[in-house]
């Protein structure tokens, strides 16, 4: 394979209403259990079928959650992040980062996603 993989990063505000089975997704990450090396962020690891997140349709596995109801999720222990969600109330506003993989052409071609230069 002679292509290069780049990523298009976008942010989105997603408003969910807590359903009968909660928010309907799983999270991993935190300062005590990093999902990505040197990144203590909180990531969506599973979208539960027919849950609030699945029915809304915008949240995706692999999304990074930046804040909950305006509260930053940076540098939190995993359990502290869980507790933020637990206490977030009925209407929950999530600021999320989507990371879309885009396939570029052959190596040496500088695509629009290239951060250099």
């Amino acid at each position: 394979m002679n292509g290069r993989v780049d990523y298009l990063v976008t942010e989105e505000e997603i408003n969910l209403t807590r359903g009968p089975s909660g928010l309907g997704f799983n999270i991993v990450g935190g300062t005590d259990q990093q999902y990505v090396s040197n990144d203590s962020g909180i990531y969506v690891s599973r979208i539960k079928e027919n849950g609030a997140a699945a029915l809304d349709g915008r949240l995706q596995e692999g999304d990074k959650i930046l804040s909950v109801n305006g509260q930053d999720l940076k540098n939190l222990l995993h359990q502290d992040a869980v507790d933020l969600f637990r206490n977030a109330g009925y209407a929950v506003s999530l600021r999320v980062q989507h990371r879309l993989q885009v396939q570029n052409g052959p190596i040496g071609h500088r695509g629009e996603g290239d951060p250099s230069g």
């Epitope: 909660g22 997704f25 799983n26 991993v28 090396s37 690891s45 849950g51 596995e61 692999g62 995993h78």
Partner: nanobody
Amino acid sequence: EVQLVESGGGLVQAGGSLRLSCAASGSIGSINIMGWYRQAPGKQRELVASITSGGATNYADSVKGRFTISRDNAKNAVYLQMNSLKPEDTAVYYCNLDRGTHLGDSFERDDYWGRGTQVTVS
């Protein structure tokens, strides 16, 4: 839903090596943590090492520098290379797949276990 099958355990002399393998099948998802835990007779189950699909690793202090965890995301498999084995490494080794904390009514870990493989160091 999820099945984990371990292999590679056995009897080895102190100072020897073993390589454990765990194959996962079912709806394991692309974002997860796979790890190895162990339980010696009369003791609690403890984390040995874990690795996320994002590549981050974590080791128990007692195995650092001797054990190496790796994974093959394409094969949904995780491996534990165990070198310089000691008698105190004797235990049943369990594979674990962790899909994170469910933000539902229970807020519990969404995880799965294999049946275990015996490692005996004489």
